[in-house]
Interface confidence: low
């Protein structure tokens, strides 16, 4: 079996708190960077990433990026600070407990990205239209 794996290390000089002043500790995300994927034309996919990482920056969330071009499909799984753009896009759905893929405009490829704020939430990426922002579950802000 493959042994336990990779940790991205990021700067952090602050403690993040929720609205009640409780310390928000780093969450767990799938973190395989960019890997080839067989996920295509499905309502949802598992990341098939065996790497579970602690996001060392407490405000970081889980992110998944699905890209398809003429040659291949890749899935990127990382931790990222939602205050900062990722692939030049703002993480608009960072408070969601589920990773709901949204298409972004990128020349020469099909590009979907999602972000979420529950442990290992980028392990299950969802493309289905039935999930949308009117779903009350997606409005939950999960504080670790």
């Amino acid at each position: 079996t493959i042994p336990p794996h990779v940790q991205k290390s990021v700067n952090n000089d602050m403690i993040v708190t929720d609205n009640n002043g409780a310390v928000k500790f780093p969450q767990l995300c799938k973190f395989c960077d960019v890997r080839f994927s067989t996920c295509d034309n499905q309502k949802s996919c598992m990341s098939n990433c065996s790497i579970t990482s602690i996001c060392e920056k407490p405000q970081e969330v889980c992110v998944a990026v699905w890209r398809k071009n003429d040659e291949n499909i890749t899935l990127e799984t990382v931790c990222h600070d939602p205050k900062l753009p990722y692939h030049d896009f703002i993480l608009e759905d960072a408070a969601s407990p589920k990773c709901i893929m949204k298409e972004k405009k990128k020349p020469g490829e099909t590009f979907f990205m999602c972000s979420c704020s529950s442990d290992e939430c980028n392990d299950n990426i969802i493309f289905s239209e039935e999930y949308n922002t009117s779903n009350p579950d997606l409005l939950l802000v999960i504080f670790q």
Epitope: S9, N12, F25, I54
Partner: antibody, heavy 122, light 107 residues
Framework: EVQLVESGGGLVQPGGSLRLSCAAS????????MTWVRQAPGKGLEWVSV????????YYADSVKGRFTISRDNSKNTLYLQMNSLRAEDTAVYYC???????????????WGQGTLVTVSS | DIQMTQSPSSLSASVGDRVTITCRAS??????LNWYQQKPGKAPKLLIY???SLQSGVPSRFSGSGSGTDFTLTISSLQPEDFATYYC?????????FGQGTKVEIK
């Protein structure tokens, strides 16, 4: 068996350069973040730098920022530390270490090399 | 950066003694606290991670406790091979800072 073997240490004059290497074996190198930690003679441990498994993310201690560069060659299972503009205070044993990688062990360095001594002196 | 303060800086003990070393963080680090043992001329060795989890292969006489800012490493019955320097390290944020070390010497 996990093994980390450092090399490249030695005596160098202030302002000089040195490149340390760390040969890794016994584990899937490219999916582990790796760190350099140093220890001045008779002193405690000081974290120097970290690089992610893919090599795409690097961070440095303020004391070495702009002078040291961490890198890795995953095809050779080797970690590097390029040290430029060396100062007397950089004199230390330099250890390469693997960051453990499962949930809470993620921040801990679970395997260390034997270290290589860097002496900066005129 | 988060400062880590260990106490005492050194202690003398006999084989069979119960030894306690404390580590205090300058801010809350949850359970992101690791303990290492280092013998002269050797590399550090991971003993405890996540404040209380025993690293594989480490004798059960070593234990860790604490969360937030205050942590403890306990050796329940000191053995001859335990005379060494012990370091705490926080891995809550980068840079992952170390304590200054506690040297355990033979009385």
């Amino acid at each position: 068996e996990v093994q980390l073997v450092e090399s490249g240490g030695g005596l160098v004059q202030p302002g000089g350069s040195l490149r340390l290497s760390c040969a890794a074996s016994g584990f899937y190198f490219d999916i582990y973040a790796m760190t350099w930690v140093r220890q001045a003679p008779g002193k405690g441990l000081e974290w120097v730098s970290v690089i992610s498994g893919s090599g795409g993310t690097t961070y440095y201690a303020d004391s070495v920022k702009g002078r040291f560069t961490i890198s890795r060659d995953n095809s050779k299972n080797t970690l590097y530390l390029q040290m430029n503009s060396l100062r007397a205070e950089d004199t230390a044993v330099y250890y390469c270490a693997r960051r453990g990688q499962y949930r809470h062990i993620a921040g801990a360095t679970d395997y260390w090399g034997q270290g290589t001594l860097v002496t900066v002196s005129s | 950066d988060i400062q880590m303060t260990q106490s005492p800086s050194s202690l003398s003990a006999s084989v069979g003694d119960r030894v306690t070393i404390t580590c205090r963080a300058s801010q809350s680090i949850s359970s992101y606290l690791n303990w290492y043992q280092q013998k002269p001329g050797k590399a550090p060795k991971l003993l405890i991670y996540a404040a209380s989890s025993l690293q594989s292969g480490v004798p059960s006489r070593f234990s860790g406790s604490g969360s937030g800012t205050d942590f403890t490493l306990t050796i329940s019955s000191l053995q001859p091979e335990d005379f060494a320097t012990y370091y705490c390290q926080q891995s809550y944020s980068t840079p992952p800072t170390f304590g200054q070390g506690t040297k355990v010497e033979i009385k």
